[in-house]
């Protein structure tokens, strides 16, 4: 994704389109450290009763133009004998997150702030049984 | 200084499978994508697919979907690249490089791996 | 599958010399391609990223240009280190794809 260009003077805060004219620094930086991220466990997705696939969702008109997204494998969840329990559902965990969406046609680039939902992971529930009146 | 360390040639009979490995130093593995290229002696490069080592997704170029498997071994910093039912026509050098997820581009190569299959 | 077309596939050329390559997209790639420089027997370095960034370390001789569909990429002044393959590449969509390449040779 490409940055917005700096403009060669700053912005006047007070001015009502001071939001339109704001350079965005797109380095990302991490604030916890180093380790954080090597701790970040990637086998859940195997172990977890719900289990879940990963997916590179892609759009080049997006920064970050890579996200990858939680899908749960299956509708019901595995029990302990590796069978699925029809009185268990899996479901899919979703966090709301911010993203730039590039303007199309604009020269140049400029971006939007939108909000997308992600899947991170998936979880197991207790099917809703209706009972019959 | 961010290295990416390849094993080393092979030669495989056709119908067999390969694994060739890439190990990673000098940065937080789990931290950027590895992606896996080849490129055959005399032609230009090939997309093979993407492993995050973070999470553990994978994604691949639909023509190794069914014989590519991309792995990632996190206490080890070392990225794998599976082929199996290799042909002729596999007979190739095969990178893994880092991909900067958020910058989008490669940066690192490993040395790459001489994969040579014949009967 | 984004085809990136370049050409010439080689060319001869003396140290001092300004060479130009060119690569097309089969469909607009918006700024995200890559350059890299390659010599027999070893991997792709990066040389330019993003069309016209050049990567940390790259002599200021490389540059690259373009924006959609068609991309340049030009060695200034050419030295006798520069002798190699050269390669474009788009990362806009996968599977990423790369040009067929073009061999720098001394004229």
């Known amino acids: 994704a490409a940055i917005i260009p700096q403009s060669s003077a700053c912005p006047n805060t007070e001015a009502k389109d001071f939001l339109q004219n704001v350079k965005v620094n797109l380095k990302v930086f991490n604030s916890l450290g180093a380790k954080v991220s090597s701790r970040r466990p990637s086998d859940y997705l195997n172990r977890s009763t719900s289990p879940w696939t990963l997916h590179r969702n892609e759009d080049p008109d997006r920064y970050p133009s890579v996200i990858w997204e939680a899908q749960c494998r299956h509708q019901r969840c595995v029990n302990a004998e590796g069978k699925l329990d029809h009185h268990m559902n899996s479901v899919l965990i979703q966090q709301e997150i911010l993203v730039l969406k590039r303007e199309p046609e604009s020269c140049p680039f400029t971006f939007r702030v939108e909000k997308m939902l992600v899947g991170v992971g998936c979880t197991c529930v207790a099917s809703i049984v209706r009972q019959a009146a | 200084e961010v290295q990416l360390v390849q094993s080393g040639a092979e030669v495989k009979k056709p119908g067999a499978s390969v694994k060739v490995s890439c190990k990673a130093s000098?940065?937080?593995?789990?931290?950027?994508?590895f992606h896996w290229v080849r490129q055959a002696p005399g032609q230009g490069l090939e997309w093979i697919g993407v492993?995050?080592?973070?999470?553990?997704?994978?994604a691949y170029n639909q023509n190794f979907r069914d014989r590519a498997t991309l792995t990632a071994d996190k206490s080890t910093s070392t990225a794998y690249m599976e082929l199996s039912s290799l042909r002729s026509e596999d007979t190739a050098v095969y990178y893994c490089?880092?991909?900067?997820?958020?910058?989008?581009?490669?940066?690192?190569w490993g040395q790459g791996t001489l994969v040579t299959v014949s009967s | 599958n984004i085809v990136m077309t370049q050409s010439p596939s080689s060319l001869s050329a003396s140290v001092g010399d300004r060479v130009t390559i060119t690569c097309k997209a089969s469909?607009?790639?918006?700024?995200?391609v890559g350059w890299f420089q390659q010599k027999p027997g070893k991997s792709p370095k990066l040389l330019i990223y993003h069309a016209s960034n050049r990567y940390t370390g790259v002599p200021s001789r490389f540059s690259g240009s373009g924006s959609g569909t068609d991309f340049t990429f030009t060695i200034s002044s050419l030295q006798p280190e520069d002798f190699a393959t050269y390669f474009c590449?788009?990362?806009?969509?996968?599977?990423?794809?790369f040009g067929q390449g073009t061999k720098l040779e001394i004229k």
């Open positions: 492993i995050h080592p973070g999470n553990g997704g994978t």
């Open positions: 000098g940065y937080t593995f789990t931290d950027y994508e």
């Open positions: 469909q607009s790639v918006s700024i995200d």
């Open positions: 590449q788009q990362d806009y969509s996968s599977p990423y794809t």
């Open positions: 490089t880092r991909f900067l997820t958020y910058e989008g581009y490669f940066d690192y």
